[in-house]
């Protein structure tokens, strides 16, 4: 995918730089497996520079390929608590709206561990809203060094 | 955060590009949980291009948002090694100096696993020194494909 | 490493931007521990923009420092199956050709878990072919949100 001549002439900032790193705000109500995120300097080291939050979900404002990364740590957890539960705890990151673009991008299970962490490159479009669904009965930690979610625009 | 007109005119190299990938040199003496790192082409595939090492700890030389990543593998471990020991083995990456900016950025425990790997975006400032603290009784592997630590400047 | 004056004058696209995100196609025949990858919009969200596939292995076309990342999830897996099997499962990412540059870049074992995920920065050269070796008797999942492999050029 080539940059247009117009893009080549524009200042660097116009090419992207969109970036966000979020911290956990709260979990959803019953029947809502989504994690709700927050970001901003007043909250600590989280920030939003380009993407937006829509009711705790991350919305993309610029088309491009993004590096999406996440770490989630379970709050009260031992190596047996994750395997003791009938329904294993699973985290999935996906596009949840618009519905026409709904897809799971990243999925991990907490087998005998208490933390999952991963990252991937994926094309995202303006208006895509990313949801992070945590299924299971264990609660996530809200410590900002244990649970976080971020995206980084890397190329058009 | 917009780029100034001056920044827009400067060659790309002036915008950042600071990057480092380090390999484990040694662990700390008694009462010092820090891992000590080394980097440079003579050592293999590790390198420092911008950031510096100060007594085995990584010091940032350019303000910006960085992607920080780490993988640590224990030299011996098991499904029971972490539970056999009273104090679970934990890795924390944080700013350790200047003291006024001291904070934990990334924390993971080795629950029934032998490797942790994660990454996050975080704002760092010139002069920030990053420390990686490994607590517990198990030794880290020094194999360069199993244990490494790096940062990448991604935007101002 | 400075950019040459010529590089500074060229449009941004000439500086790199090489990037790929691949999905699992199939495993190798007996005695071949390599995973075989595929990519392209017709397949879903995988893509190759610069790097190429050579018989399912990723070949680099531009010198530079790359962020290499991978996630592999085992298909039929419980927290005990990884330890119960006679052949423990390990994943290694490395340069497999040219032979003169053969080296392991990233190695992880599935201890009592069913997913590994990691990333690292590493210098790669035009013509380097990356192989991902999965040793053991457990099969990887081909779900595109569970198993993927990618590289991103980050600087010269």
């Amino acid at each position: 995918q080539r940059l247009s001549r117009a893009q080549q002439q524009l200042p660097l900032e116009s090419l992207g730089w969109d970036i966000a790193e979020l911290q956990l705000n709260h979990t959803g109500p019953q029947q809502d497996p989504r994690l709700y995120w927050q970001g901003g300097p007043a909250l600590g080291r989280s920030f939003l520079r380009g993407p937006e939050l829509d009711k705790g979900q991350l919305r993309i404002r610029r088309d491009g390929i993004y590096m999406v990364h996440i770490q989630v740590t379970l709050a009260i957890c031992s190596s047996t608590s994750t395997s003791r539960h009938h329904h294993p705890t699973t985290l999935a990151v996906g596009i949840c709206s618009p519905a026409s673009r709904s897809i799971s991008l990243l999925r991990l299970s907490f087998h005998q561990g208490c933390t999952i962490a991963s990252q991937r490159l994926t094309p995202l479009a303006r208006g895509d809203t990313l949801c992070t669904n945590l299924t299971g009965t264990l609660l996530p930690s809200r410590n900002t060094d244990e649970t976080f979610f971020g995206v980084q625009w890397v190329r058009p | 955060q917009r780029l100034s007109r001056a920044q827009q005119q400067l060659p790309l190299e002036s915008l950042g590009w600071d990057i480092a990938e380090l390999q484990l040199n040694h662990t700390g003496p008694q009462q010092d949980p820090r891992l000590y790192w080394q980097g440079g082409p003579a050592l293999g595939r590790s390198f420092l291009r911008g950031p510096e090492l100060d007594k085995g700890q990584l010091r940032i030389r350019r303000d910006g948002i960085y992607m920080v990543h780490i993988q640590v593998t224990l030299a011996i471990c098991s499904s029971t090694s972490t539970s056999r020991h009273h104090h679970p083995t934990t890795l924390a990456v944080g700013i350790c100096s200047p003291a006024s900016r001291s904070i934990s950025l990334l924390r993971l425990s080795f629950h029934q696993g032998c490797t942790i790997a994660s990454q996050r975006l975080t704002p760092l400032a010139r002069g920030d020194t990053l420390c990686t603290n490994l607590t517990g009784t198990l030794l880290p592997s020094r194999n360069t494909d199993e244990t490494f630590f790096g940062v990448q400047w991604v935007r101002p | 490493q400075r950019l040459s004056r010529a590089q500074q004058q060229l449009p941004l696209e000439s500086l790199g931007w090489d990037i790929a995100e691949l999905q699992l196609n199939h495993t190798g025949p007996q005695q071949d521990p390599r995973l075989y990858w595929q990519g392209g919009p017709a397949l879903g969200r995988s893509f190759l923009r610069g790097p190429e596939l050579d018989k399912g292995q990723l070949r680099i076309r531009r010198d530079g420092i790359y962020m290499v990342h991978i996630q592999v999830t085992l298909a039929i897996c419980s927290s005990t199956s990884t330890s119960r099997h006679h052949h423990p499962t390990t994943l290694a990412v490395g340069i497999c050709s040219p032979a003169s540059r053969s080296i392991s870049l990233l190695r992880l074992s599935f201890h009592q878990g069913c997913t590994i995920a990691s990333q690292r920065l590493t210098p790669l050269a035009r013509g380097d072919t990356l192989c991902t070796n999965l040793t053991g008797t457990l099969l990887p999942s081909r779900n595109t949100d569970e198993t993927f492999f990618g590289v991103q050029w980050v600087r010269p």
Epitope: - | A75, I76, C77, S81, L139, P140, S141, R142 | P88, H111
Partner: antibody
Framework: EVQLLESGGGLVQPGGSLRLSCAAS????????MSWVRQAPGKGLEWVSV????????DYADSVKGRFTISRDNSKNTLYLQMNSLRAEDTAVYYC?????????????WGQGTLVTVSS | EIVLTQSPGTLSLSPGERATLSCRAS???????LAWYQQKPGQAPRLFIY???SRATGIPDRFSGSGSGTDFTLTISRLEPEDFAVYFC?????????FGQGTKLEIK
């Protein structure tokens, strides 16, 4: 040439104490993790304790935990094992052993051993 | 703790013959972290094989290691007089590391 030379063994009564030393030469001692491994007369080998290159991390076999203390003095290229509350079952030849550079728990060089006999 | 069982306890062979020593683990451990040592009477153990199949420095190529998971083998393709000794296997994948009870290789 890598050399490890143990000393300090001997006869001691149950409940007594002993301090073993291991003098290292021929390599950069401060760059390697070290372990003590023992072998009861006519028996197999048993790992006892490990210490990291700089001395900040130690670990022990359950059979000696709380009674033995491993330490090192990198300025003297010497490894130590302080053994307290000794029992008859601690009778063995004690070897100091160097870990592979990767820190993996296999041992590429061993000393000749020193015999500890715990008996009344 | 992983228990390593070596067999046979004693192996009687003649120089020039092929020796096959077995080491079986009570559970599998990661990445083939198994070593073999040779010990002669009154001497310290000497590392021969690590990583299940890699020969240590100075070990002749008549010695080879194989296996993975729970079953490992040390093979001496053609016995020399100096090869008669006790051989111990050791796993170093799971804490605590542990040793087999040894196989005595004696001259027939």
């Amino acid at each position: 040439e890598v050399q490890l030379l143990e000393s300090g063994g001997g006869l001691v009564q149950p409940g007594g104490s002993l301090r073993l030393s291991c003098a290292a030469s021929g390599f950069t001692f401060s760059s390697y993790a070290m372990s003590w491994v023992r072998q009861a007369p006519g028996k197999g080998l048993e790992w006892v304790s490990v210490i990291s290159d700089s001395g900040g991390t130690t670990d022990y076999a359950d059979s000696v935990k709380g009674r033995f203390t491993i330490s090192r003095d990198n300025s003297k290229n010497t490894l130590y094992l302080q053994m307290n509350s000794l029992r008859a079952e601690d009778t063995a030849v004690y070897y100091c052993a160097r870990h592979d550079y990767s820190n993996r728990y296999y041992f590429d060089y061993w000393g000749q051993g020193t015999l500890v006999t715990v008996s009344s | 703790e992983i228990v390593l069982t070596q067999s046979p306890g004693t192996l009687s062979l003649s120089p020039g013959e092929r020796a096959t020593l077995s080491c079986r683990a009570s559970q599998s451990f990661s990445s083939n972290y198994l070593a073999w040592y040779q010990q002669k009477p009154g001497q310290a153990p000497r590392l021969f094989i690590y990583g299940a199949s890699s020969r240590a420095t100075g070990i002749p190529d008549r010695f080879s290691g194989s296996g993975s998971g729970t079953d490992f083998t040390l093979t001496i393709s053609r016995l020399e007089p100096e090869d008669f000794a006790v051989y111990f296997c050791q796993q170093y994948g799971i804490s605590p590391c542990s040793f087999g009870q040894g196989t005595k290789l004696e001259i027939k």
